[in-house]
């Protein structure tokens, strides 16, 4: 009786089955009655990852420096290349496949969190006793400055944007 | 349909060189393997070698030394060459496919002077 | 190279009676992927070998089911329950596990 369902790791092609390509490699020919199921390796810059039956390789995924792209891990020919943005850029997507600029944090807003090659900056407004007075895509909020510790009072009052103006206290004649 | 069809010499003259071709239709030799039996006169099959779909080729250990099979998949050809022949070369050459039963209808190569 | 021998060289048998035909080989045919690729070939004069069976067991498409394969490893038997005057021939295994592949001296089945 021919198979209706074969073992992991085979295909059912013909009445019979064959063993599937490990990764790294694609399919030629189909086994027979005579002969095993025939694979070749990938080429260079081709990869597969997973046991197959494809007729072609994938190729490497290209990491294009004019959409600010650069390798972060080379491609096998069982993995993909994977690609990250240059200094100062992220992904837009999950694939990588193309990068913008981090955000900067306006005035009011400090960094909650840096962004990285795959994640952009991350902010939030600052609280009450904090500021952050430039655009910035690294600088945290910054606490007021704390006039009573240097023996100073509170000659302006600190917002989100700026700080406390600290002056001296009135001498007391 | 799947068809091969062998054509030879007929009359090869000893230490001379025997060229064959095997033109096949109805499938492709990028993804099917060819091998070549030869069966001399009363005696039984022999097999000489065999081109991969990938290819490559592999052969008898006998024959090894002056037999090369090649193919111009382009062309749907698969082509035997065996050089130095002797009276014993002489056989009915076959092109055969390797799923199913595929055969040639063989070609008779006779080595006499 | 694989040795492949038949036995016997010749097979007269009785129109109705069953015929068996053994062929060893001089290595395991099993393959590392788990198949065995033993087979057997009837040839008629006058015609290139026709397959009859591959794989010890499976019979080639249009084969009649008197024809059956068994065995493993090294041993193998083609069976014929039933005879009949058109499987008169040679019969010959062949191995094409291991290259280069090779074939047995065959068998003469002959009607008595």
């Known amino acids: 009786e021919p198979p209706t369902a074969c073992r992991e790791k085979q295909y059912l092609i013909n009445s019979q089955c064959c063993s599937l390509c490990q990764p790294g490699q694609k399919l030629v020919s189909d086994c027979t009655e005579f002969t095993e199921t025939e694979c070749l390796p990938c080429g260079e810059s081709e990869f597969l990852d997973t046991w197959n039956r494809e007729t072609h390789c994938h190729q490497h995924k290209y990491c294009d420096p004019n959409l600010g792209l650069r390798v972060q891990q080379k491609g096998t020919s069982e993995t993909d290349t994977i690609c990250t943005c240059e200094e100062g850029w992220h992904c837009t997507s999950e694939a990588c496949e193309s990068c913008v600029l981090h955000r900067s944090c306006s005035p009011g807003f400090g960094v909650k969190q840096i962004a990285t090659g795959v994640s952009d900056t991350i902010c939030e407004p600052c609280p009450v006793g904090f500021f952050s007075n430039v655009s910035s895509a690294f600088e945290k909020c910054h606490p007021w400055t704390s006039c009573e510790t240097k023996d100073l009072v509170v000659q302006q009052a600190g917002t989100n944007k700026t700080d406390v103006v600290c002056g001296p206290q009135d001498r007391l004649r | 349909q799947v068809q091969l069809q062998e054509s030879g010499p007929g009359l090869v003259k000893p230490s001379e060189t025997l060229s064959i071709t095997c033109t096949v239709s109805?499938?492709?030799?990028?993804?099917?393997?060819v091998y070549w039996i030869r069966q001399p006169p009363g005696k039984g099959p022999e097999w000489m070698g065999m081109?991969?779909?990938?290819?490559?080729?592999d052969y008898s250990t006998s024959l090894k030394s002056r037999l090369t099979i090649s193919k111009d998949t382009s062309k749907s050809q698969v082509s035997l060459k065996m050089s130095s022949l002797t009276a014993a070369d002489t056989a009915v050459y076959y092109c055969?496919?390797?799923?199913?039963?595929?055969w040639g209808q063989g070609t008779l190569v006779t080595v006499s002077s | 190279d694989i040795v492949m021998t038949q036995s016997p060289l010749s097979l007269p048998v009785t129109p109705g009676q069953p015929a068996s035909i053994s062929c060893r080989s001089s290595?395991?045919?099993?393959?590392?992927?788990?198949?065995?690729?033993l087979h057997w070939y009837l040839q008629k004069p006058g015609q290139s070998p026709r397959l009859l069976i591959y794989?010890?067991?499976n019979r080639f498409s249009g084969v009649p089911d008197r024809f059956s394969g068994s065995g493993s490893g090294t041993d193998f038997t083609l069976k014929i329950s039933r005879v009949e005057a058109e499987d008169v021939g040679v019969y010959y295994c062949?191995?094409?596990?291991?290259?280069?592949?090779?074939f047995g001296g065959g068998t003469k089945l002959e009607i008595k």
């Open positions: 055969v496919r390797t799923d199913g039963d595929y």
């Open positions: 109805g499938f492709s030799l990028s993804r099917y393997s």
């Open positions: 081109m991969w779909g990938g290819g490559s080729t």
């Open positions: 290595q395991s045919l099993a393959s590392s992927q788990g198949n065995t690729y």
């Open positions: 794989k010890v067991s």
């Open positions: 062949s191995q094409s596990t291991h290259v280069p592949w090779t």
